[in-house]
């Protein structure tokens, strides 16, 4: 038998060489080209396991897109035909709570999550006999990467499920800790930087296959929370990085989410974008914003993929994506996940399991409406590969998909056997569908979320609400004391109230200057390299938030450190959430906050508000009867008609949908 080369096993402290056998009903046989379902016998630590796999048809959209750039820097769009891909999910026969994510492209490669251990498997290099290496994931050497705080062991969870009869694949994969009864879908977009692309030999196909493999691993980890990962797109910076990756992790993350908002969202709708970088940040494995998965401006993370395996890297991306989904670090909390460390532990431990705390954090996000974008089942043109009626995703060619026959008994609109609408039905799902009928045009489907937001309405001929828009960045709000920024009116008092309760308000400017000139964790203008930056006096209002009149101490599932600083007859209150270096600090002043006349905070600096590019003269453009929205169109007050609020009408904009039902005014009046 071939022996593994040094390269292949140098990262392993222990491994076995095995030969998996493919199972058919008649006999064991050597492998042949992959199919929709397949079973193998594999050996691990002296035991034989039968593994059952099915192609992960939920993984890729039919219109999965890959963006690259040519030598001139021109964007190239490719829709690779990868419907019959070789990426599988599955379970181990007879092992409770097991799950598997494997590719069967060139031998078996992937992860097996058993009850008490996770294994990696990969083809043995240069073997002509289908030999593979199998190893415990605990036996993988990892450089000590972190997300800020030191690693702590988690108590082992010993609960076991009782099983009566062999469940179906779907039941098995859903059985693990389904935090909420309703499945959530994360439409994930991955961006790969130039250095990582170079590291992969500038082979676009290899990068693409590796990222699909990564998404399959993520899906296998998130399924325990009843969250599905759908990889909707991939961008490879083949011609050079499109953001500046010099500086600390926070700088790069900020640059990335700004680029995403400006260039990526308009090209491909998605819920979260993750940047994959080769460059490290002094032991920090990644960084992401917390609870921002549905945010236009902050739904992103950065992830360091250096000299580690894709299996190990998957836990880093799972961790950073977890932050986007509202999950805080497990450290210092009473969390358990059935392993010695969990995915959201601050040290990048290579764990495959989410803890009870992560489940609770995600549930809080959904209860606070922070995860509304995860409810949409991808539309037919975004639905994944290998269309399949009964998978609860509306694939191309389907009008609806109510799931299993039993689930479909409860659906009045959808014909379960054909995934077509019943004869009398106009729709089966969506914000603008009720009782199998389109809601009338003009029905509010997305209400305002702040004074800087605008509502959207059903159009009467679609089950979907109009795309979300808000008032253009830079529009004055809060009686001219603040500016609108990404749909929110950003001002100090409101930020203090979010953290310290409804009576709190901003501390005097002297507090900001005194505290933020120190350059420590309680007063700073960001983080550079390994140290906090002191604020120059002119930027002090853009550093740590300082509040007064505090009557409530915040509790966000994580206990923050609070500091009081006496200053000129008042107490300045600030907070450090100790979320670790991979999480932007929610105790800092928000971007877009007005820090002076005609100035706003950006990147912890007080800069000219012209950077917001507000260019709407509401008197001229909207005739004094409306505001400009984020698409630079007028949103008219009730009583005036779009597009320019010049004539009498019923409000709204060309983007919002109609505010009343033009087709049936008799019904209305």
């Amino acid at each position: 038998a071939a022996r593994p080369g040094f390269q292949q096993t140098s990262h392993l402290s222990s491994y076995e060489i095995i030969t998996p056998w493919r199972l058919t009903r008649e006999r064991r046989e050597a492998p042949r080209p992959y199919s929709k379902q397949v079973s193998y016998v594999i050996q691990a630590e002296g035991k034989e396991h039968i593994i059952h796999l099915e192609r992960n048809k939920d993984l890729l959209p039919e219109d999965f897109v890959v963006y690259t750039y040519n030598k001139e820097g021109t964007l190239i769009t490719d829709h690779p035909n990868i419907q019959n891909h070789c990426h599988y999910r599955g379970y181990v026969e007879g092992v409770h709570n097991s799950s598997i994510a494997l590719s069967d492209c060139f031998g078996l490669r992937g992860l097996l999550h058993l009850e008490n251990a996770s294994y990696g498997i990969e083809p043995l290099q240069n073997s002509s006999h289908f030999e593979h290496i199998i190893y415990r994931m605990d036996d993988v050497y990892k450089e000590p990467l972190k997300c800020g705080v030191s690693n702590k062991d988690i108590e082992k969870e010993t609960a076991k499920d009782e099983e009566e009869e062999p469940p179906s694949m779907t039941q098995l994969l859903r059985r693990r800790r389904a935090v909420l009864p309703q499945t959530r879908y994360v439409e994930l977009f991955i961006v790969v930087d130039k250095e990582r692309y170079d590291m992969m030999g500038r082979n676009q196909t290899a990068v693409r296959e590796e990222m699909i493999l990564l998404a399959n691993y993520l899906d296998s980890m998130y399924i325990m929370l009843n969250i599905r990962i759908v990889l909707v797109g991939l961008e490879i910076w083949t011609n050079g990085n499109l953001i500046n990756i010099v500086g600390g992790a926070g700088d790069v993350l900020g640059n990335f989410v700004q680029w995403r908002e400006k260039f990526l969202i308009t090209r491909r709708r998605h819920d979260s974008a993750q940047l994959v970088l080769k460059k490290g940040f002094g032991g920090t494995a990644g960084m992401a914003f917390v609870g921002t998965v549905c945010s236009r401006s902050h739904a992103g993370g950065i992830n360091v993929f250096g000299q580690i395996t894709v299996e190990t890297f998957a836990s880093i991306v799972a961790h950073e994506l977890g932050h986007n989904l509202g999950m805080n670090h497990d450290d210092g909390r009473d969390c358990s996940c059935g392993a010695k460390s969990c995915i959201m532990n601050s040290g990048a431990s290579g764990s495959r399991n989410f803890s009870s705390c992560s489940a609770e954090d995600f549930e809080k996000l959904t209860l606070n409406k922070g995860g509304n974008c995860l409810l949409n089942i991808p539309k037919p043109d975004e639905a994944y590969s290998a269309p399949s009626c009964g998978n609860k995703l509306v694939d191309a060619g389907e009008e609806c998909d109510c799931g299993t026959p039993k689930e479909c008994e409860l659906d009045p609109c959808c014909e379960g056997s054909t995934c077509k609408l019943k004869s009398f039905a106009e729709c089966a799902y969506g914000d603008c569908c009720k009782d199998c009928r389109f809601l009338p045009g003009g029905t509010l489907c997305r209400g305002k979320t702040s004074e800087c937001d605008v509502p959207e309405y059903c159009n009467g001929s679609s089950q979907f609400c109009q795309p979300d828009v808000f008032i253009q960045n830079g529009y004055p709000c809060q009686n001219n004391k603040a500016y609108c920024y990404n749909g929110m009116c950003q001002y100090y008092d409101a930020q203090c109230q979010v953290i310290f309760g409804s009576k709190a308000k901003a501390a005097p400017k002297d507090c900001f200057i005194e505290v933020n000139s120190k350059g420590d964790r309680f007063g700073n203008c960001g983080f550079s390299g390994n140290e906090y930056k002191k604020c120059a006096t002119g930027n002090a209002l853009c550093g740590k938030l300082q509040c007064e009149n505090v009557q409530e101490i915040p509790v966000f599932g994580i206990v923050p450190a609070i500091i009081q600083t006496p200053s000129r007859g008042t107490k300045c209150w600030g907070v450090d959430f100790q979320l670790g270096s991979d999480v932007p600090d929610p105790g800092m002043v928000n971007e877009g906050t007005k820090c002076g006349a005609g100035k706003i905070c950006r990147n912890f600096q007080c800069v000219d508000a012209s950077v917001l590019n507000y260019d709407c003269d509401v008197q001229k453009k909207c005739h004094g009867h409306g505001v400009c929205n984020s698409n630079k169109n007028c949103h008219c007050e009730n009583g005036w008609a779009p597009p320019n609020c010049e004539t009498k009408g019923y409000g709204g904009s060309v983007d919002s949908g109609p505010t009343y039902n033009e087709m049936n005014t008799a019904l209305r009046d």
Epitope: L439, P440, L444, G447, D669
Partner: nanobody, 125 residues
Framework: EVQLVESGGGLVQAGGSLRLSCSSS????????MGWFRLRPGKEREFVAA????????DYVDSVKGRFTAIADVAKKTVFLQMTSLKPEDTAVYYC??????????????????WGQGTQVTVSS
């Protein structure tokens, strides 16, 4: 303009049920989410429940959860408040109101643009 008219109030014994109706008119009635508020003697106006016209999103004050249900019928241009297991402390004037705010703002009376005239609910012990 949206006009709102409540009905269905009355006197009921503790443990009993009532169904309040709020009929809306005006060309843009469905362009608003609908809320129910109540004014109890000697107290401030209090949020009770809210619903969107699809019925897919609902919200309730803790004290009525499990007892009150908001229902929206877009064809009849009416929202209902089904009240069961009524208690003496539910005695109040109940108002329906219309807002363009979503669930992040619809508990606050200040974000409502149109109000009905109110209907009295009295629960005797």
């Amino acid at each position: 303009e949206v006009q709102l008219v409540e009905s269905g109030g009355g006197l009921v014994q503790a443990g009993g049920s009532l169904r309040l109706s709020c009929s809306s008119s005006g060309r843009t009635y469905s362009a608003y989410n609908m809320g129910w508020f109540r004014l109890r003697p000697g107290k401030e106006r209090e949020f009770v429940a809210a619903i969107n016209w699809s019925g897919g999103t609902q919200d309730y004050v803790d004290s009525v959860k499990g007892r009150f249900t908001a229902i929206a019928d877009v064809a009849k241009k009416t929202v209902f408040l089904q009240m069961t297991s009524l208690k003496p402390e539910d005695t109040a004037v109940y108002y329906c109101a219309a807002t363009q705010w979503g669930s992040s703002g619809w508990k606050q009376a200040r974000w409502y643009d149109f109000w009905g005239q109110g209907t009295q609910v009295t629960v005797s012990s």
